[in-house]
């Protein structure tokens, strides 16, 4: 018994397309072996029509393709412009046609609906443009040209060469008469509506010698592409409507009851509140195509989505559209992670970001979602050692705890840090999560002095006061740099006196820098962690100056400056241009992301805003 499986019977009509999926066990050998589609002959042979190695029979030229999806263990044969001659018995299979790893498929193509003789069939998508060509003879060259539509038993005039236009077609139809050399006139109808479908008759002349040509216009409502994504994952809708609408406002909407389609996002700046923080509409290409990324998929996001083009930025009759049916799989591989993390002004947050554990070597990124215009997400930090200049000293991306999770720590929080942030990688585009940082009332738990000045050649001791709530946590000091925060030795100096109502379990832990050098200048963090899970941090900037008087410096909280709201960094810090995630295909299509800092970064991230879990900033 062959392990290949597919549809036993496929039925269609002339002029239509079919898409035949064949399933195979996705073993390593099967994934890479030849895939084929062949037609069975009367004597038992099977003639290859198309294969995964590039062969296409002349019978299929320009109307068929075969696509292998090795990760799913499937391959798909698409055949367009079907005729009754395509009816017959076929095999889809792996390897060599005669070897038996195949599945029998019966394709039956029946005649389409009855048409008048000499009828030209035009099949056009909703919202697009059709050109109906009407030949005539020399004797009718100077006579009236007209197009009628058959409504029931009666032909109704649509347009004619004397300037008449039927009100149903106003503003979207024209009649062109070709130059004297060509005996042809054409009628162009754009923004096609479903109601435009039907039988048409073109006519040149009005007497018994007139030339007539029948046309059958079929207007296709786009069949929705089925998209099946995981809860908490992300989806990208790629919308290619054609260059003719390149300068028209674009939209993505979700169909609600009946024919209503509620705008999710459009290029006129509208965005549905339910998608705040988790949607990007990527700038359109010159050909008018664009894409929309939605992250943090929720159960209620399932449904039918349409993208289209219309000056109003919403669905109207005659809008060219593309359709998707989104199904959200609740058996998600993407773990739950907090959707809201809270921190206090001056304090810190530690955000856990999930990623596909099979892609531990992927580059990790963190970006700040901005709602202006169509949404963008400028990168703030990556795992390759880049940090946006304004975040130097207060932002770090750590590979810990690993195995499917990385950590982002942001300290010296201000109210301006409130907002939505996306975790993403240059690997699996479905693994993107969004977290909202909220700044709440309160005091930071860790107490450190403000900026500190050390003297060259002397010893500096910097205190960090930990309240008793962190008694069971590991306490550490580290020196911040672009790639993380390198741990430094520290001394436990016993209980702290910095906290009221705090017992012996509070702690004062000091960082000591002996024989200070210029290299010691920079940002230092004290913090708490449990194993590989990080909690709160506090930052101190240590400046180094020339010796003025001998001795060592012991900095206390009282002597320290107040922690600055904004840091003005040494002019030597390299300013790196603003990088924004704008093109989600960048990662999807495996374009080189060797140094994303030098390009407008694409990425695809996911949010779990469907869950109401919240994570405090001070502890895990």
């Amino acid at each position: 018994k062959s392990p290949i499986f597919g549809p036993e019977e496929v039925n269609s009509v002339e002029g239509n397309s079919v898409s035949i999926t064949c399933y195979y066990p996705p073993t390593s050998v099967n994934r890479h072996t030849r895939k084929y589609w062949c037609r069975q002959g009367a004597r038992g042979g099977c003639i290859t029509l198309i294969s995964s190695e590039g062969y296409v029979s002349s019978k299929y030229a320009g109307r068929a393709n075969l696509t292998n999806f090795p990760e799913n263990g499937t391959f798909v044969v698409n055949i367009a412009q079907l005729s009754q001659d395509d009816s017959g018995r076929y095999k889809c299979g792996l390897g060599i046609n005669s070897r038996g790893l195949s599945f029998d498929v019966s394709l039956e193509v029946s005649q389409g609906p009855g048409l008048l003789n000499d009828t030209k069939v035009y099949t056009v998508d909703l919202g697009r443009t059709v050109t109906i060509n009407c030949p005539f003879k020399t004797e009718n060259a100077q006579k009236r040209k007209s197009l009628y539509k058959q409504i029931g038993l009666y032909p109704v005039l649509v347009i004619d060469s004397s300037g008449y236009v039927n009100p149903n077609y106003t503003g979207r139809i024209r009649l062109d008469i070709q130059g004297t050399g060509q005996l042809l006139f054409s009628v162009v109808i754009n923004q096609l509506r479903l109601s435009d479908a039907g039988q048409y008759l073109c006519q040149a002349g009005d007497d018994s010698n007139s030339n007539k040509k029948n046309a059958d216009l079929q207007v296709l409502k786009p069949e929705p592409e089925l998209v099946y994504e995981d809860l908490r994952g992300s989806v990208t809708f790629h919308c290619a409507l054609g260059p003719e609408v390149a300068n028209v406002a674009k939209f993505l909407c979700r169909q609600s009851s009946g024919e209503n389609c509620d705008v999710v996002v459009n290029t006129l700046g509208k965005r549905a509140p339910a998608f705040e923080g988790r949607i990007l509409l990527n700038p359109q290409d010159k050909d008018g195509s664009f894409s929309v990324v939605i992250t943090g998929l929720r159960k209620e996001d399932a449904g039918r989505y349409l993208c289209g083009a219309h000056s109003d930025g919403q669905l109207q009759e005659g809008s060219p559209i593309q359709a998707w049916q989104l199904f959200v799989n609740e058996e998600s591989t993407i773990p739950r992670s907090p959707t809201v993390v809270k921190g206090v002004a001056g304090g810190s947050v530690a955000v856990l970001c999930p990623y596909n554990r099979k892609e531990s070597k992927s580059i990790k990124y963190w970006c700040l979602w901005e709602g202006a215009q169509n949404g963008r997400c400028p990168l703030l930090v990556d795992s390759e050692g880049w940090v946006k200049a304004q975040y130097e000293g207060r932002l770090s991306l750590l590979e810990e705890p690993g195995n499917g999770t990385f950590t982002v720590i942001l300290n010296q929080l201000t109210s301006r840090d409130a907002g939505f942030y996306w975790c993403l990688t240059n690997g699996d585009t479905l693994w993107r999560t969004t977290v909202e940082i909220k700044i709440i009332e309160g005091e930071p738990n860790l107490k450190v002095p403000g900026n500190v000045t050390a003297v060259l050649g002397e010893t500096l001791k910097v205190p960090c006061h930990f309240p008793c709530k962190f008694s069971s946590y590991e306490k550490y000091w580290c020196k911040w740099n672009n790639t993380g925060c390198q741990a430094l030795p520290s001394q436990d100096e016993g209980p702290s006196k910095a906290f009221v109502n705090c017992d012996e379990n509070s702690r004062l832990v000091s960082l000591t820098l002996n024989l200070v050098t210029r290299a010691d200048e920079g940002w230092y963090w004290c913090g708490v962690k449990q194993g590989h899970f990080y909690g709160e941090t506090a930052a101190v900037y240590v400046a180094v100056e020339e010796r003025k008087a001998a001795g060592s410096r012991d900095v206390s909280l009282a002597k320290a400056d107040a922690a600055p709201d904004e840091k003005v960094l040494d002019s030597g810090f390299r300013e790196i241009e603003n990088k924004a995630i704008q093109d989600p295909r960048l990662f999807a299509e495996e374009k080189a992301v060797a140094d994303t800092r030098d390009q407008a970064d694409g990425s695809r991230a996911s949010v779990d805003s469907g869950s109401s879990e919240e994570q405090g900033g001070s502890s895990r």
């Epitope: 499986f5 019977e9 239509n16 079919v18 898409s19 296709l220 089925l226 049916q325």
Partner: nanobody, 126 residues
Framework: QVQLVESGGGWVQTGGSLRLSCAAS????????MGWFRQTPGKEREFVAA??????????YYTDSAKGRFTISRDNAKNTVYLQMNSLKPEDTAVYYC?????????????????WGQGTQVTVSS
Amino acid sequence: QVQLVESGGGWVQTGGSLRLSCAASGRTVSSYYMGWFRQTPGKEREFVAAISWVGSSTYKYYTDSAKGRFTISRDNAKNTVYLQMNSLKPEDTAVYYCAARPRVGDPRSRYDDDNWGQGTQVTVSS
């Protein structure tokens, strides 16, 4: 969700025929696989046949034991799927279930728990 109601089961002798119906309500099932499965006591549900359609193209899938004997079909206007079972054998005795799921992936698997009918008993006696 799609609500599914099966009917048409019953008792028949070996070699006889039955026609099962599955009426779907709640939403149109044009973007779904509609499948027939069967289950005998103490065994897992097994795939029998499935149908899907896109526009005016229809795709029919059968398990090996159903090929040549069973025919799956649909009536769009009634939002109903049928399983015509001919040349029935005692081993076809089972509870037959109708199921629906999004038209993605292998039609033999991944049907959600809440998209099943209540089942109809088919008994074939020798």
